[in-house]
């Protein structure tokens, strides 16, 4: 991949171990708790991110524990099973034998169970609604200059295709960004839609999974766009299955 | 048209300082990161610097780093390099560049220049 | 790294098509074009494959790892020119190639 010989590190995650032991000397990065290599010239799936995040030292930690408005985290950090190829698999289950559903960004879709839960299948969100709001400004924001300027983030610095970023809508001071990419249209190659929604939540909380320049610098027209507050909505290609009485 | 006019150049002398400065139309200036690229005689394309769009982000080669200093002023169109204690080697052709990547994780890479000034020559001669 | 890997020269007949490779870098990749010593250079690919809308469609980039491509399909004469490439290493520092002379025969 792409890091470079002469100081082995991985620009796309900073939760990883490198080292120039892949072919012909190569750097090679390894993530944290999986040790499972890394493309260092693209994202790490979520799955990883959490694994490593859960596997790193507590004064170590780069990362902290999300606000209680991130419904990703609902039931709060959990350290989860992650298949060959990163993504999440389907059952996850704590140390406890307490096993539940998950759709592709991790998050809980069906009541918990034990370890007599069956998950058929993982499925897939293929449409993520980022809800930001932004702190007072002079003057509200030009909304197409704003429009430009997220899905240009978007394209930039997640390599997010830009046909995946369906829609900005503005409401001062409410910001939602809405991310839609299918099965049938997700082709290989093109970065996920749960793993550019989280980099983006790291990166809006000060937390950049980048190494080098790190933080966002978001500007609309030189005005600082500065988040306050962030909630992400997740929807599933198949509704979650929960119970009645937690639906009350 | 994207345009880019550095000026500055010329006979300087070892040990002290210039300062070279890039005007630009044609483009949303506010909106890019600007790069320095120098290139000796008869020699290959040498990475200088990059600041961001708003200025408050800056990188260096090693070659030049703790003597050189990159700003940028939006509401001008302007970039400037101040190159202090002056050596020979610093003698060349020096570019200013557009960037096209402000928001990449690799956006100080060459790879992200678009557009190229016509350059100013530096000379660092006693 | 001090300086990314490039050929130092290659040579075609009109109308083939050339490749210039270039590895040691680390995320995105460009090309720039030099006529003469000392003219400015042009920038024929920036963000590994993009081109430009006044540079022909002969020219293309495409990157793999940490090596990209330069590809003239059908070059000319008027091609002739050194070739840099342009790409950072992992600190963030950027990194140009020594450069390839482009000889059209």
């Known amino acids: 991949h792409t890091a470079a010989q002469d100081n082995c590190t991985c620009p796309t995650n900073k939760m990883t171990v490198c080292s120039p032991d892949g072919p012909g000397g190569r750097c090679q990065c390894r993530a944290l708790g999986s040790g499972m290599a890394v493309d260092c010239s693209t994202l790490t799936s979520k799955c990883l991110l959490l694994k490593a995040r859960m596997s790193a030292p507590k004064n170590a930690r780069t990362l902290v524990r999300p606000s209680e408005h991130a419904l990703v985290d609902n039931d709060g950090l959990y350290d989860p099973d992650c298949d060959p190829e990163g993504r999440f698999k389907a059952r996850q289950c704590n140390q406890t034998s307490v096993c539940w559903c998950v759709n592709s960004v991790g998050v809980r879709r069906t009541d918990k169970g034990d370890l007599s839960l069956r998950c058929d299948e993982l499925v897939r969100t293929h449409h993520i609604l980022i809800d930001l709001r932004h702190r007072p400004t002079a003057g509200a924001f030009n909304h197409s200059d704003l429009d430009a300027e997220l899905r240009r983030l978007f394209r930039e610095r997640y390599r997010l295709h830009p046909k995946f970023v369906a829609a900005v809508h503005y409401e001062q001071p409410t910001i939602q960004i809405e991310l839609r990419q299918n099965t049938s249209q997700k082709a290989a190659g093109d970065v996920d839609i749960g793993d550019a929604a989280y980099y983006f939540e790291r990166d809006i909380k000060g937390e950049s999974l980048f190494q080098g320049r790190g933080g966002l610098d978001l500007r609309v027209r030189g005005e600082p766009l500065q988040v306050e507050r962030t909630l992400i909505y997740y929807l599933d290609e198949i509704p979650p299955k929960f119970s009645m009485k937690r639906l009350t | 048209a994207v345009t880019l006019d550095e000026s500055g150049g010329g006979l300087q002398t070892p040990g002290g300082g210039l300062s070279l400065v890039c005007k630009a139309s044609?483009?949303?200036?506010?909106?890019?990161?600007m790069f320095w690229v120098r290139q000796a005689p008869g020699k290959g394309l040498a990475w200088v610097g990059v600041?961001?769009?708003?200025?408050?982000?800056?990188n260096y080669a090693p070659a030049v780093k703790g003597r050189a200093t990159i700003s940028r002023d939006n509401g001008q169109s302007t970039v400037r390099l101040q190159l202090n204690n002056l050596r020979a080697e610093d003698t060349g052709t020096y570019y200013c560049?557009?960037?096209?990547?402000?928001?990449?994780?690799?956006?100080?890479?060459?790879?992200?220049?678009?557009?190229w000034g016509h350059g100013t020559e530096v000379i660092v001669s006693s | 790294a001090l300086a990314l890997t490039q050929p130092s020269s290659v040579s075609a007949n009109p109308g083939e098509t050339v490749e210039i490779t270039c590895s040691g870098g680390?995320?995105?990749y460009g090309w720039f074009q030099q006529k003469s010593p000392g003219s400015a250079p042009v920038t024929v690919i920036?963000?590994?494959?993009y081109r430009l809308s006044d540079i022909p469609s002969r020219f293309s980039g495409s990157a793999s790892g940490s090596t990209a491509t330069l590809t003239i399909t059908g070059v000319r004469v008027e091609d002739e020119a050194v070739y840099f490439c342009?790409?950072?290493?992992?600190?963030?520092?950027?990194?140009f190639g020594a450069g390839t002379t482009l000889t059209v025969l």
């Open positions: 560049a557009k960037g096209v990547c402000t928001h990449c994780w690799d956006a100080d890479s060459a790879g992200n220049i678009d557009a």
């Open positions: 044609g483009f949303d200036f506010i909106d890019y990161d």
């Open positions: 600041i961001n769009r708003s200025g408050s982000y800056t």
């Open positions: 680390s995320g995105n």
């Open positions: 920036y963000n590994n494959n």
């Open positions: 342009g790409s950072a290493d992992s600190t963030y520092v950027g990194l």
